[in-house]
Amino acid sequence: PRSIEVKYIGVKSAYVSYDAEKRTIYLNITNTLNITNNNYYSVEVENITAQVQFSKTVIGKARLNNITNIGPLDMKQIDYTVPTVIAEEMSYMYDFCTLLSIKVHNIVLMMQVTVTTAYFGHSEQISQERYQYVDCGRNTTYQLAQSEYLNVLQPQQ
């Protein structure tokens, strides 16, 4: 068998809402993956499991099942959404994300994704992880891979 390639493309969109009383941020993050089947036979994408970390804490998980079939020598682009919650011991982020004196509220998130494929009864798992910038201050739609190159606010040294 030839390889199945999984390429994490980046964040497609991030939709944000807040709970002022709980000082909680809800971020629905939609990511894009390219999965390429280099084989001469079809491959089933059984599931995609994803999680998002902020500051080494898991803030969201998602699992998609029975996703799609990828034909021989074909590639499919798949979007998946991870609902995330920034709360409790990270509630200090609420002030940052809702601060109006800042124009862009970029935070660094670690995106982890595992794709499980199957062919002829054999399963294979491919994992990727990537740090991405996401704006927690407003709803944002990104050009593909744009969120890799955004600036994150840093205090002067």
Epitope: V16, A20, F96, S101, R138, P155
Partner: antibody, heavy 122, light 112 residues
């Protein structure tokens, strides 16, 4: 240390113009909106406006449209407030302010200059 | 513009008393992001304003817990549970939801 340092007191003649400065240290003004506030003697606080130092885009309270002009120079990390056609009504203390992120934990700090006193007198 | 009206203009209190200041906005001050940017400042003579409360009830860092904010819609209140000498000064409510941002007229907290 995060702070805003304003220029010194000004004594001006009616009809003249004055330009006040507000220099930031500990953060880059281009990452933030900068605000100006006026307080006349024995009076309340008045919001003059805000500027985006990155592109110079400014928004004013209607009362200060035509009276105040906000500018910024990101290379010197300084915001400016120019007041034109001065009258006794412009005698006041003027403050610059913003709210900044002051550490790696995204914590916020309300930051004000010490104020610049402008006296208009013939 | 959003008009911010504070009551009372002057509030004489004895040290240790509770003080309550009211602020009313001429329209709702909910920002498009769903937050209400209603803030309270204390201004003392010769000093810059000091932020006490933001987003209605969020006590800013370093502010004693005797200060509390409440309210919704167009009616907001600042309470000081036990007034101390260092609390004297002029209190201003402020809305930072809609440009142009606006301050209330101020309430002077003074000793009876």
């Amino acid at each position: 240390e995060v702070q805003l340092q304003q220029s010194g007191a000004e004594l001006m003649r009616p009809g003249a113009s004055v330009k006040l400065s507000c220099t930031a240290s500990g953060f880059n003004i281009q990452d933030y909106y900068m605000y100006w506030v006026k307080q006349r003697p024995e009076q309340g606080l008045e919001w003059i406006g805000r500027i985006d130092p990155e592109d110079g885009d400014a928004e004013y309270a209607p009362k200060f449209q035509g009276k105040a002009t906000m500018t910024a120079d990101t290379s010197s990390n300084t915001a400016y407030l120019q007041l034109s056609s001065l009258t006794s009504e412009d005698t006041a203390v003027y403050y610059c302010s913003t709210r900044v992120i002051y550490d790696g934990y995204y914590r916020t700090m309300d930051c004000w200059g010490q104020g610049t006193s402008v006296t208009v007198s013939s | 513009d959003v008009l911010m009206t504070q009551i009372p203009l002057s509030l004489p209190v004895s040290l240790g008393d509770q003080a309550s200041i009211s602020c009313r906005s001429s329209q709702t001050i909910v920002h498009s992001n769903g937050n209400t940017y209603l803030e309270w400042y204390l201004k003392k003579p010769g000093q810059s304003p000091k932020l006490l409360i933001d987003k209605i009830s969020n006590r800013f860092s370093g502010v004693p817990d005797r200060f509390s904010g409440s309210g919704s819609g167009t009616d907001f209140t600042l309470k000081i549970s036990r007034v101390e000498a260092e609390d004297l000064g002029v209190y201003y409510c402020f809305q930072g939801s809609h440009v142009p941002y606006t301050f209330g007229g101020g309430t002077k907290l003074e000793i009876k």
